[in-house]
């Protein structure tokens, strides 16, 4: 279930969930809702200061790189 993840524990979880894609500590600019909103929170804020689940962690994974064509 959801739990708080802080420090190295959070990094380990992101590495596990995102794998080779890598991850961001902040969502990329323009990600999701309007960029006019209040200051963005990052994965540290979202998962260390309240419980977070797998789906929230996945939001901070880097996008899959498209396969190179032959």
């Amino acid at each position: 279930g959801p739990e708080t993840l802080c420090g190295a524990e959070l990094v380990d979880a992101l590495q596990f969930v995102c794998g080779d894609r890598g991850f961001y500590f902040n969502k990329p600019t323009g990600y999701g809702s309007s960029s006019r909103r209040a200051p963005q929170t990052g994965i540290v804020d979202e998962c260390c200061f309240r419980s977070c689940d797998l789906r929230r962690l996945e939001m901070y994974c880097a996008p899959l790189k498209p396969a190179k064509s032959a």
Epitope: T4, L5, C6, G7, A8, E9, L10, V11, F25, N26, A38, P39, Q40, T41, G42, V44, D45, C48, F49, R50, S51
Partner: antibody
Framework: QVQLQESGPGLVKPSETLSLTCTVS????????WSWIRQPPGKGLEWIGY???????NYNPSLKSRVTISVDTSKNQFSLKLSSVTAADTAVYYC?????????????WGQGTTVTVSS | QSVLTQPPSVSGAPGQRVTISCTGS?????????VHWYQQLPGTAPKLLIY???NRPSGVPDRFSGSKSGTSASLAITGLQADDEADYYC???????????FGGGTKLTVLG
């Protein structure tokens, strides 16, 4: 057991930059979140900012334009710089640590260092 | 004006039970962010007293307890003792400010 010790000048002139260092012992700076908090005389606690060793930083919006928190992993230290100080920045400055075992609570604090802004 | 609102002072006699409230909003406590409580004895650094709404770090007596409901949290101290006299602060995270926030602090006076 992680221990923290603040150091820096006790007196800073108005418009200058306040610089403080927090030395970490008993733990690696690469494992936790590190914070600065201040307390003006006779007033409450004010969060200044925190960072994770990976480079993630977050600052109090009211101070953001003047604050920089950085880390020196080789010395196991992190520092606070606050520019263009005024008398309102006179306070006891604390460094603190979130080890991650306390759901984001700041479980280790330095003893604090008093900074006076005066000419 | 603090984002988290606490009463400036509370008091009680030795042995009594007192509670300290911490009222927030839908962008901090009400958004599911954990609440932490700190005790600051005169002339000393704050000490973490309750973390994650209702957990005690090792060494903190079970006379101290925390709870959270909706947009508010509270700290309860039972069996009040003279050395509980201190300032108490709540802390959480606020998504609209994208930062940590403290309550204004509550001075606990132990009477007699």
């Amino acid at each position: 057991q992680v221990q923290l010790q603040e150091s820096g000048p006790g007196l800073v002139k108005p418009s200058e930059t306040l610089s403080l260092t927090c030395t970490v012992s008993g733990g690696s700076i690469s494992s936790y979140y590190w914070s600065w908090i201040r307390q003006p005389p006779g007033k409450g606690l004010e969060w200044i900012g925190y960072f994770f060793y990976s480079g993630y930083t977050n600052y109090n919006p009211s101070l953001k334009s003047r604050v920089t928190i950085s880390v020196d992993t080789s010395k196991n230290q992190f520092s606070l710089k606050l520019s263009s100080v005024t008398a309102a920045d006179t306070a006891v400055y604390y460094c603190a640590c979130i080890t991650g075992t306390t759901k984001g609570g700041m479980d280790v604090w330095g003893q604090g260092t008093t900074v006076t802004v005066s000419s | 004006q603090s984002v988290l609102t606490q009463p400036p002072s509370v008091s009680g006699a030795p042995g009594q039970r007192v509670t300290i409230s911490c009222t927030g909003s839908s962008s901090n406590i009400g958004a599911g962010y954990d609440v932490h409580w700190y005790q600051q004895l005169p002339g000393t650094a704050p000490k973490l007293l309750i973390y994650g709404n209702n957990n005690r770090p090792s060494g903190v007596p079970d006379r101290f307890s925390g709870s959270k409901s909706g947009t508010s949290a509270s700290l309860a101290i039972t069996g009040l003792q003279a050395d509980d006299e201190a300032d108490y602060y709540c802390q959480s995270f606020d998504s609209s400010l994208s930062g940590s926030v403290f309550g204004g602090g509550t001075k606990l006076t132990v009477l007699g």
